[in-house]
Every structure is written in structure tokens, then in C-alpha cells.
């Protein structure tokens, strides 16, 4: 039901060529009160002006409600993420109705004639919502749409058409081609609902992107930058490249959103925390681990309701399964000067010793360039709460690894052979952690050695809480 | 109780085209999927595809690409699967199997096998 | 596609034996594994889903286990009507896939 490739064909076909036989009966749309966890169990079909479903199937008027909206489909039957879904609802909200928007027969056609059918869905969805609400006890402020791909934005044309105003809208990756832009009536936006949350997994600035990379929601949470998902390469989906092809690809990045609500529903006590930044290129170099003024906030459904005057994009990284939560670090490094640097960055390695756990060997990403007699900021996740960090082992890695830096390695020697060593000095790295938001200062072991050069390594010890030292003045101001 | 039956046993020449049969009775036809499986002479188990009767939407395996058509009839609870051009590889029993909505659903009741045999 | 491998081919044994058979996935199916028993000029009959859970009905010496790509069946005491052919089938990814049989044959 995802993806305008999903994975049971080849992708040229996809756009073009319709998977569904001609239908005899004109499409409609179902409503499947889901009744228990079991997806064995054939549920409840409602219909609007037939109350006996509703007291037949124990429909809890003042509980809350979720209606489930699927996507484009190529099969004709619902894929696994629905079940997974349903049963995580029913598992965290155990009084909750919880019902399936079967539009199969819309669904199962020409991407773009699926695209046309949103509109006409969204009115079935509302209709529903509209006789709902002449019920006693009912209250639209209880529902919570979950529309995954173009039913992100069937669940935005039900709350654009519904009498009131929905709770909630949580869009889960909401398609791109032919909303890409589009006119806010025409998509997925925040006057839909009370409170529009997005999760953003398949984004792509070339190519197609599957998912829309624009904000429509109160916020947007774009895990791992929106686009490549850890787990997710040819080589992770795959196994054996033999048994494969792109489109899993696809669907796994695509269908990630589903599975990081599901995971918030299920490991509660492992939230995924997101933080407000500008764009992703500055959420990797760690300027955006605050949680100052609602900058940060659970993602999926434990999401706290904020309703920005604009679009909130956030970001986080995470695992690349279940549960999905990693620990975010903000490591400020001041380099006081270097030596000789030539062309090339140094690739730096840290590894993290905490009272709970030592990280693995982090890479420090530097995403444009060391600069000197300046702050240079790094963010590191990792996958273990390391408890409170004792002590920080910092690596500058020896032999270039890339033939892109043996290159300038050298050139440079070409240029400069009696080139002395490389070497730079850092006397103290401030931490910042996401999730705590505690800020810590890390001193070098010996203050008389403060320099490092390649294949060497400096050793930090905590020196203090907080950040401010002692007749200093702070030579960069926090960013958002 | 559920129960699928399917059409009687079948000889065609190469070439030509079968259609068979699955009656459903004992459940709400339109509720769940109706998928076709084959098994070849003393061999295992080949999905072929599936309808959904609730719209008529169809999904085949693509190694039978254009040669197999299934259709329903929701008046009379009916399933059909035609395959066309035959050929001897074809000779197998077709089985019509119930499967909920989800890919995970298991096939849980089956009609008793419709025995085709292509020959010359 | 996913390749579904199931193993023994055949094994032969005794009313009373415990028996397993086990199916390999060429992926991770994410437990959406299901088991059948067929005998001759029959058609089959399912036996377990998700991995796990009994169909009713089905004895409870029947029992299924494994996770990702390794799953077993397992009969704990077999019984003179346990013997006929047994298929495991993923329900992950289309096209659904069985795996080649087990015969399972009295000793």
C-alpha cells in the first residue's frame, strides 16, 4: 500500500501500468472497526446511519479513536505495517476504537488516478466523523488520524472537510509526487487538525521523492535527515543481492515512518527525542541539541502538542530497528592552533566512557571544515545510554583511508616534502547531551600536552559541570 | 462452517484455456482474499495469485504475467481463475485457498483441488 | 523472491518420536511464517501462523518457534495421522513463497 514503486514489480511499470482488473462495482470505502489484536479477526464494518455495529462491536463512544488510512496500493490486499500498527494501538490504548479506512478500491489503480480518489476518500472519512458526532459522548477532539503515504493526505482532506476540528493528524511519510508544492487545501497542512505531527523518511532532492520533503504539519520530524535509513541499503534489505531489488529499498525507507510510530507506541520507556534545527546539514554539525522554548520533542505518539505559528523541522538519528532511540551529543572542540594542516581535514574518532557503558568508536563528521582559534562543534549518537560520561579518548586516524586523501597527501608531499608533522591542540571538549540536556566540560589528562597529531590519541577527564570556566569568556555564542 | 468447493477435474489440449471454479460458503465472501495456489505432479506448493471479491482487484505472480485472469462473482459467492495457452507444465492441481487481509494472513480453509491436465 | 528452504527433504520415524523440521528464509520474514500439513490427494491444511500461534482445531503436540530466518516445527509426540508432508510459507513479501516440503514417513 506504500510506495509509488512498492516491491512487487519493476519500477518503470509503476506510475503507468495499473495492477487492479477492471472493477464491476463501483469503488467505495469501508470502515473496519478493528475489535481485537488478533489481524485474524474480521472486525466490524460501520456504516453510516447504522448504529447496530456500534453496539454490537462495543464502539467506546467517549474513548479515544483512531482511524488508520492506507496508501497507494499495487496488490490489492493491506500489507504487514497495517497489522503491526493496529496491534500497538490496541496494546498502548487498550479502551480505544480502532478503525481501518479500507479504500482498496481507490487505492488499487494509476498512481495518479489514486491521487485524484484522496479527495472523494477524505469525504467518506469526514462523513463518518460528521453522524459520529451526533452521537452522544462522542467528541472529535478524541480522534487521531494516522495516514500513511497518500493517506497522509486523505487523512488532511478529512479533517479540511469535516463540521469541527479533528484532535490529531499524524502523517507517516507523506507521499511527494503530485503534492510536492501543492496549494495547502490540496495536501496534507496544519489546519487539518488541532495538531499535525509528520514523520519524514523517504525524502530525496534527486531523483523522485516518494515521500514529500516540504513541512505540512505543526512539526516535521525528518529521522536520520529524512532520507537514507539506517538498515536500509541494498546491502542491509537484500541479504543476498540475488533475492532483491531497489524497490525493497523503497519500501523500507518509505515504511520506516510507520514502524518509528509504532515504536513509540510500544517502547514507551524508550522515547526518541527530535530537535528543531534549520536544516539537516546543521543538525549534523550538533548546533541543534536544545530543548530551550519547545525546541525538542518526542516523536510519533508520545509527540507534545505544539502549535508553532510556522513549520517546525526537527531532527534526530536513530537505530536501525526496534527499539530506534539513540543518545545525541553535542561535542564542542576548541582548537587552539595547528601545524602544517595542508589540504586535507583530519578525521577524528571519539570514544565515549560512561558509568553505565563505553560507546563504540564514533566517527566525528565534518561537515565543512576544521577551522582554527575556533569552536568546532560535532554531533555523536549512540546506540547504549552510557550513563554519565567519565572520560572522553579522542583519535586522529593515521593512514587516509580514502584515495581521495592519499591524493592530496600526495600532492601536498610534491608540493612540501620535508612537510614536519601535522599537529593541532585542543584543551578542553564541552559536551552537551540531547536527551538531558547536561552540559559537561571535559579537560585534557595532562594540561602540559594538549596537542595531537595523526595516529595519536589525547585523553579527556571531566573538569567540571556546565560549560562556563573560570575567568573565561564563552568564544561562541549557543545556537538553536 | 467455512467451506470453498471447487470445479471437477479438467483435460485440455496445449493452447488452450481452463477456467475453474471456487464456491465459498460459511463466511462473508466479500471479507477476506481469495488466493490460487498450483502443485505440479509429486512437486510443492506454487502461489499464483489473489482477487480481493470485496472490488474484484487482482495481484499475480509475475512468473504467470498475463496468462492467468481471476474474476469473482459476489452474487454467488464465486471465485474463478482461467489460464490461458497451456502447456504440458501446466498439469497440476489448482487449489483456491481463503486468506485474510493482511500479506500475513495465513491461508486458512482451501477448496479440495481441481486436477488439470494438458496433453496432446 | 524469497526462497523458502525447508530441511530434512524426508525423514523417517516412530508413533511416539519427537520430530522437527526446520525452514530457512533467504531474508528476514519478520515472523510472518506460517505451516501446513498436506496428505495424499488432499489439499492442505494449515497447522500454525505467525510462527507461533496454533490454528484451531490443530493438536497442541504441534508447536512453532524461530525468529527472523530460522524457524522450526516441531511435533512433540508423534501419531499415526502425523504422517504426510509438511510445507512452511512466509507471508512477508509477494509473491508468497512455500518452502519444498518435508515428508515425513513412518520408520
Known amino acids: 500500500s506504500p510506495v509509488p514503486f512498492g516491491p512487487e514489480g519493476r519500477l518503470e511499470d509503476k506510475l503507468h501500468k495499473p495492477k487492479a482488473t477492471q472493477t464491476e462495482v463501483k469503488p467505495s470505502v469501508r470502515f473496519n472497526l478493528r475489535t481485537s489484536k488478533d489481524p485474524e479477526h474480521e472486525g466490524c464494518y460501520l456504516s453510516v446511519g447504522h448504529s447496530q455495529p456500534l453496539e454490537d462491536c462495543s464502539f467506546n463512544m467517549t474513548a479515544k479513536t483512531f482511524f488508520i488510512i492506507h496508501g497507494w496500493t499495487m496488490s490489492g490486499i493491506f500489507e504487514n505495517w497495517l497489522h503491526k500498527l493496529v496491534s500497538a494501538l490496541h496494546t498502548r490504548e487498550k479502551d480505544a476504537n480502532v478503525v481501518v479506512v479500507d479504500w482498496l478500491p481507490l487505492a488499487h489503480q494509476l498512481y495518479t488516478d489514486a491521487v485524484n480518489n484522496t479527495r472523494v476518500v477524505g469525504h467518506s472519512i469526514a462523513r463518518m466523523l460528521d453522524w459520529l458526532q451526533e452521537k452522544d459522548d462522542f467528541s472529535l477532539g478524541n480522534v487521531h488520524l494516522i495516514g500513511y503515504s497518500l493517506g497522509a493526505h486523505v487523512a488532511g482532506y478529512a479533517g479540511n472537510f469535516v463540521k469541527g476540528t479533528v484532535g490529531r493528524i499524524t502523517g507517516l511519510d507523506p507521499a511527494g509526487p503530485m503534492f510536492e508544492g501543492a496549494d495547502i487545501h490540496k495536501r496534507l497542512s496544519p489546519d487539518d487538525a488541532d495538531f499535525v505531527d509528520v514523520l519524514h523518511t523517504y525524502t530525496r532532492s534527486f531523483g523522485l521523492s516518494i515521500g514529500i520533503q516540504m513541512p505540512v504539519g505543526h512539526i516535521d520530524i525528518y529521522p536520520n535527515g529524512g532520507d537514507f535509513q539506517p538498515g536500509c541499503g541494498l546491502n542491509d534489505v537484500l541479504g543476498s543481492i540475488a533475492y532483491g531489488t531497489i524497490t525493497e529499498v523503497v519500501k523500507c525507507e518509505h515504511e520506516r515512518a510507520v514502524h518509528l510510530f509504532v515504536d513509540s507506541l510500544v517502547n514507551q520507556d524508550k522515547p526518541s527525542f527530535a530537535f528543531q534545527c534549520t536544516d539537516s546539514n546543521r543538525f549534523k554539525k550538533g548546533i541543534c541539541l536544545s530543548c530551550r522554548k519547545n525546541r525538542c520533542n518526542s516523536i510519533g505518539y508520545n509527540a507534545k502538542k505544539m502549535r508553532n505559528k510556522r513549520n517546525s523541522k526537527m531532527y534526530l538519528k536513530t537505530r536501525a530497528g526496534m527499539p530506534f532511540r539513540v543518545y545525541h551529543y553535542q561535542m564542542k572542540i576548541h582548537v587552539f592552533s595547528y601545524k602544517n594542516m595542508g589540504e586535507i581535514e583530519p578525521t577524528f574518532y571519539v570514544t565515549l566512557y560512561g558509568t553505565n557503558a563505553d560507546s563504540q568508536t564514533l566517527p566525528l563528521e565534518i561537515v565543512e571544515r576544521i577551522e582554527q582559534n575556533a569552536t568546532n562543534t560535532f554531533l555523536v549518537y549512540t546506540e547504549e545510554d552510557l550513563g554519565d560520561l567519565l572520560k572522553i579518548q579522542l583519535t586522529w586516524e593515521g593512514a587516509s583511508q580514502s584515495w581521495y586523501n592519499l591524493w592530496k597527501e600526495f600532492r601536498s608531499y610534491l608540493s612540501q616534502p620535508r612537510n614536519p608533522g601535522r599537529e593541532l591542540n585542543i584543551r578542553r571538549i564541552r559536551v552537551k547531551s540531547g536527551e538531558t540536556q547536561r552540559k559537561l566540560t571535559f579537560c585534557t589528562e595532562d594540561p602540559e600536552n594538549t596537542s595531537i597529531s595523526p595516529g595519536r590519541e589525547l585523553w579527556f577527564r571531566k573538569c567540571r559541570d556546565g560549560w562556563r570556566m573560570k575567568n573565561e569568556t564563552s568564544p561562541t555564542v549557543e545556537l538553536p | 462452517q467455512v467451506q470453498l468447493v471447487q470445479s471437477g477435474a479438467e483435460v485440455k489440449k496445449p493452447g488452450a484455456s481452463v477456467k475453474v471454479s471456487c464456491k465459498a460458503s460459511?463466511?462473508?465472501?466479500?471479507?477476506?482474499?481469495i488466493h490460487w495456489v498450483r502443485q505440479a505432479p509429486g512437486q510443492g506448493l506454487e502461489w499464483m495469485g489473489h482477487?480481493?471479491?470485496?472490488?474484484?482487484?487482482?495481484n499475480n505472480n509475475e512468473k504467470f504475467k498475463d496468462r492467468v485472469t481471476m474474476t469473482r462473482d459476489t452474487s454467488i459467492s464465486t471465485a474463478y481463475m482461467e489460464l490461458s495457452r497451456l502447456r504440458s507444465d501446466d498439469t497440476a492441481v489448482y487449489y483456491c485457498?481463503?486468506?485474510?487481509?493482511?500479506?500475513?494472513?495465513?491461508?486458512?480453509?482451501w477448496g479440495q483441488g481441481t486436477t488439470v491436465t494438458v496433453s496432446s | 523472491d524469497i526462497q523458502m528452504t525447508q530441511s530434512p527433504s524426508s525423514l523417517s520415524a516412530s508413533v511416539g518420536d519427537r520430530v522437527t523440521i526446520t525452514c530457512r528464509a533467504s531474508?528476514?520474514?519478520?515472523?510472518?511464517l506460517n505451516w501446513y500439513q498436506q496428505k495424499p490427494g488432499k489439499a492442505p491444511k494449515l497447522l500454525i501462523s505467525?510462527?507461533?500461534k496454533l490454528h484451531s482445531g490443530v493438536p497442541s503436540r504441534f508447536s512453532g518457534s524461530g525468529s527472523g530466518t530460522d524457524f522450526t516445527l516441531t511435533i512433540s509426540s508423534l501419531q499415526p495421522e502425523d504422517f504426510a508432508t509438511y510445507y512452511c510459507?512466509?507471508?512477508?513479501?509477494?509473491?508468497?513463497?512455500f518452502g519444498q516440503g518435508t515428508k515425513l514417513e513412518i520408520k
Open positions: 482477487i480481493n471479491p470485496y472490488y474484484g482487484g487482482t
Open positions: 505467525y510462527t507461533s
Open positions: 531474508q528476514d520474514i519478520n515472523n510472518y
Open positions: 460459511g463466511y462473508t465472501f466479500t471479507d477476506n482474499t
Open positions: 485457498a481463503r486468506k485474510g487481509i493482511y500479506y500475513s494472513s495465513p491461508f486458512d480453509y
Open positions: 510459507q512466509q507471508g512477508n513479501t509477494l509473491p508468497f513463497t
